[in-house]
């Protein structure tokens, strides 16, 4: 009696368990009772990536210089091209097919996680005892400088955008 | 018998232009990825360009970008290189080699065409 | 772009000797779909053109005598010839066919002791 269910890398064609191909081929013609399935390999700059009954491979994607990416891992007949974005831009999205120029933290915040090719930067308010001045995609808040240990005085606050400023202490004459 | 015989090379003087050729026999061209490899005299090998079977991906090293075009026509078997802005550090042996859909390797080379950028 | 670099710049071996040189890469080779290292060997003779030696780290081009053996993964990678012949003199190179920019190791010149 004709199966239902076939084996693993098999698939149910006509009533018959034929072989799936392999990754890096396509079907070309189902098995019949006296021959395998035929397939065939997958062009160059085309891909399969699983075992499969596809007629057709699929093209590799082009990271395109001009969205600003670049080649991560090169495409195989088994696996797709991954794309990244040049440094300084990051993905606009997973499967990466734009990029983005690098968000840059304002003064007053500060960079709590760099930028990598897929994530953009995140930036945090500077606390109280912090500053930034500058507007960057690498600067993390700094802290006020301690005019103590400098044996000086505060003679300006500091705020989240600027650096305490020390002065002499008013000598007792 | 594969093979791959470039042409086009010669001496030019910097800023100049030059078109090089690789014309492919012995296999069916439009199934192979192509590339242009460059090797400056006593020295190593350096990728220089890419282009896919059927023309749809192109990648350059930055050397290279801006100033080299890479094409193909596939109904005449032949890959080309198209390089403007020559400078002297261009001056190098011009490989072709083709790539396959299986190794994704550089597996048959020509004897290559010598480029000087000189004045 | 990946670095390679390969050791030693040249070497000079006894006919018959074996003869092993090294190559790293300055990231994995490794791609993540099919487990392939994407590391492939060349071979220039004097005055040729290179021609492909070994692909996905080890395995030989059809045509390559067996002496020829590829080892390693990752970012480490060895070629072996384990009978050095005449005909092996010759300038090796190793490539990262993994991405691109391709790019070439400074090569290993093999020359007879």
């Known amino acids: 009696e004709p199966p239902t269910a076939c084996r693993e890398k098999q698939y149910l064609i006509n009533s018959q368990c034929c072989s799936l191909c392999q990754p890096g081929q396509k079907l070309v013609s189902d098995c019949t009772e006296f021959t395998e399935t035929e397939c065939l390999p997958c062009g160059e700059s085309e891909f399969l990536d699983t075992w499969n009954r596809e007629t057709h491979c699929h093209q590799h994607k082009y990271c395109d210089p001009n969205l600003g990416l670049r080649v991560q891992q090169k495409g195989t007949s088994e696996t797709d091209t991954i794309c990244t974005c040049e440094e300084g831009w990051h993905c606009t999205s997973e499967a990466c097919e734009s990029c983005v120029l690098h968000r840059s933290c304002s003064p007053g915040f500060g960079v709590k996680q760099i930028a990598t090719g897929v994530s953009d930067t995140i930036c945090e308010p500077c606390p109280v005892g912090f500053f930034s001045n500058v507007s960057s995609a690498f600067e993390k808040c700094h802290p006020w400088t301690s005019c103590e240990t400098k044996d000086l005085v505060v003679q300006q606050a500091g705020t989240n955008k600027t650096d305490v400023v020390c002065g002499p202490q008013d000598r007792l004459r | 018998e594969v093979q791959l015989v470039e042409s086009g090379g010669g001496l030019v003087k910097p800023g100049g232009s030059l078109r090089l050729s690789c014309a492919a026999s012995g296999f069916t061209f439009s199934d192979y990825g192509m590339h242009w490899v460059r090797q400056a005299p006593g020295k190593g090998l350096e990728w220089v360009a890419y282009i896919s079977s059927g023309n749809r991906i192109i990648y350059y090293a930055d050397t290279v970008k801006g100033r080299f075009t890479i094409s193909r026509d596939n109904a005449k078997n032949s890959l080309y290189l198209q390089m403007n802005s020559l400078r002297a550090e261009d001056t190098a042996l011009y490989y072709c080699?083709?790539?396959?859909?299986?190794?994704?390797?550089?597996?048959?080379w020509g004897q290559g065409t010598l480029v000087t950028v000189s004045s | 772009d990946i670095v390679m670099t390969q050791s030693p710049d040249s070497l000079a071996v006894s006919l018959g000797e074996r003869v092993t040189m090294n190559c790293k890469s300055s990231q994995s080779l490794l791609n993540s779909g099919n487990q392939k290292n994407y590391l492939t060997w060349h071979q220039q003779k004097p005055g040729q053109p290179p021609k492909l030696l070994i692909y996905w780290t080890s395995t030989r081009e059809s045509g390559v005598p067996d002496r020829f053996s590829g080892s390693g993964s990752g970012t480490d990678f060895t070629l072996t010839i384990s009978s050095l012949q005449a005909e092996d003199v010759a300038v090796y190179y190793c490539?990262?066919?993994?991405?691109?920019?391709?790019?070439f190791g400074g090569g290993t010149k093999v020359e007879i002791k």
């Open positions: 490539q990262n066919d993994y991405t691109y920019p391709l790019t």
């Open positions: 080699a083709r790539q396959d859909g299986y190794r994704y390797a550089m597996d048959y």
